[in-house]
């Protein structure tokens, strides 16, 4: 039972966690306009990986998508790729963990193939949750870096006349995001590989029999043949507690922004 | 589209006075109010702003401590009131409704407020 | 504070004729995020409210009649009456839109011969 726990508790998580992916990937605040020690300005500035948005006091927002694929720095669009790379594997490792539950009965699905199933799908939600992680992880960088540039050049003008404003970029909501969702993803994926174990079949050791040979006492008893699955064995049917699964993944999305032309 | 201000004041140095602006056409909480000073012959000065939807204000160093608007919805009326009135108070004040790029797209018609003794 | 300075202080011109005044701000008004320019003009008929003309700095209002043209970037902007009527008597002032607190020229007061 433990098994089956462990398994759809692991599924749900990584649910939880593609669909954080999915959140953050089509989200307009990865980067946000840093307001700290800026002259207050009426316009607030945010950028996504497809768009970049300015919101006036007024409240009237407006939003523009990067229509050109060549002029985008290729970080972005690296960044682009495994966001989109980590969504794919989720997705696909996601459908074949449905057909992997125990709790599902497909035909005469053996237990072997859903175990092989389940190590699939657990190693596409590491390699998914890897990819957001990365993703997440090299947008943040890029704006620590262009962070740092653009306040050296605040204080850097001509004659120390600085006459345009330099907007600087910050960290916003969908990195957070992402983060959580990808450790979340990751989290589900081993959850899966453990329930993988416990999922294989269990070593069949076949009864002793004893064969008389005339004038002899001798018994031949056949070695334990393993049902080869590669996962190993110890898989005793146990009771399991089915415990759902409670998250708590509430993350505040703020309304700033970085120059990609 | 409508901002209808009350009418015009004639106070006493050191006291307060509250003037309103009464918007209709448009959906009240949506918008930002915005009030601007004049003085007779003078430019324009802005005081602040309130969101009605929110009552969160923002307000020019200048008139913090002087003015404090306030807005009720059910009445779609906007507030500022003006206290320790002193001659340099005697001015027309604007209310506006804020717009794209944050203008003041609509004004209302103005209300003179006079300090005297 | 965002300093808008207009010039000329007043002009006086005859209907018909085409009329340029000029705003500086301290500070670029121009927001990297939308190319925009926070940069709104006014106009101000005599023991009237202030009336809208251009928003984004170029940007006409509706109902504003297409004689009036407002351009310009960063810091240095224009309001151009391409050809004067007798109902443009007004101050004409310009507003920093985009820096708190908001700051107005001081106007430009258009007479008419």
């Known amino acids: 039972m433990a098994v089956t726990a462990c398994q759809g508790l692991g599924f749900v998580v990584s649910l939880i966690g593609i669909a954080g992916i999915i959140a953050a990937t089509c989200m307009d605040q990865w980067s946000t306009q840093d307001l700290y020690n800026n002259p207050v300005t009426a316009v607030f500035n945010y950028q996504g990986l497809w768009r970049s948005c300015v919101r006036e006091s007024s409240g009237f927002t407006e939003c523009r998508g990067y229509f050109t694929l060549l002029g985008l720095p290729a970080m972005l669009q690296a960044v682009r790729a495994l966001m989109i790379v980590g969504i794919v594997l989720g997705a696909i490792g996601l459908l074949v963990s449905i057909f992997a539950l125990k709790c599902i009965r497909i035909g005469s699905m053996e237990d072997s193939a859903k175990a092989n199933m389940t190590l699939t799908s657990g190693i596409m939600f590491i390699v998914s949750g890897l990819c957001a992680i990365a993703g997440v992880s090299v947008f943040a960088n890029m704006l620590v870096t262009n962070f740092w540039m653009s306040t050296a050049n605040m204080y850097t003008g001509m004659g120390g006349m600085v006459q345009t404003v330099q907007t600087r970029y910050t960290f916003g909501a969908a990195l957070f995001v992402g983060w959580v969702a990808g450790g979340l993803t990751l989290i589900g994926g081993v959850m899966m590989c453990i329930a993988c174990r416990g999922l294989a079949p269990e070593e069949t050791n076949y009864k002793a029999v004893s064969y008389h040979a005339s004038g002899h006492s001798v018994a031949y008893k056949p070695g334990g043949f393993k049902a080869s699955t590669g996962f190993g064995s110890n898989t005793k049917n146990k009771k399991i507690y089915d415990g759902g699964a409670r998250t708590e993944d509430e993350v505040q999305s703020y309304p700033s922004k970085h120059d990609y032309v | 589209v409508q901002l209808q201000e009350s009418g015009a004041e004639l106070v006493r140095p050191g006291t307060s006075v509250k003037v309103s602006c009464k918007a209709s056409?448009?959906?009240?909480?949506?918008?930002?109010i915005e009030w601007v000073k004049q003085r007779p012959g003078q430019g324009l000065e802005w005081i602040g702003m309130?969101?009605?939807?929110?009552?969160?204000?923002n307000y020019n160093e200048k008139f913090k401590g002087k003015a404090t608007l306030t807005a009720d919805k059910s009445s779609s009326t906007a507030y500022m009131q003006l206290s320790s009135l002193t001659s340099d108070d005697s001015a027309v004040y604007f209310c506006?409704?804020?717009?794209?790029?944050?203008?003041?797209?609509?004004w209302g018609q103005g209300t003179l407020v006079t300090v005297s003794a | 504070d965002i300093m808008m300075t207009q010039s000329p202080l007043s002009l006086t011109v005859t209907a018909g004729e085409k009329v340029t005044m000029s705003c500086k701000s301290s500070q670029s008004l121009l927001n990297s995020g939308n190319l925009k320019n926070y940069l709104t003009w006014y106009q101000q008929k005599p023991g009237q409210p202030p009336k809208l003309l251009t928003y984004?700095?170029?940007t006409r209002d509706s109902g504003v009649p297409a004689r009036f043209t407002g351009s310009g970037s960063g810091t240095d902007f224009t309001l151009t009456i391409s050809s004067v009527q007798a109902e443009d008597l007004a101050v004409y002032y310009c507003?920093?839109?985009?820096?708190?607190?908001?700051?107005f020229g001081g106007g430009t007061k258009l007479e008419i011969k």
């Open positions: 056409g448009y959906a009240f909480t949506n918008y930002l």
């Open positions: 309130i969101n009605p939807g929110s009552g969160g204000t």
């Open positions: 984004w700095a170029s």
């Open positions: 507003q920093n839109d985009y820096f708190y607190p908001y700051t």
């Open positions: 506006a409704r804020g717009g794209f790029g944050n203008s003041f797209a609509y």
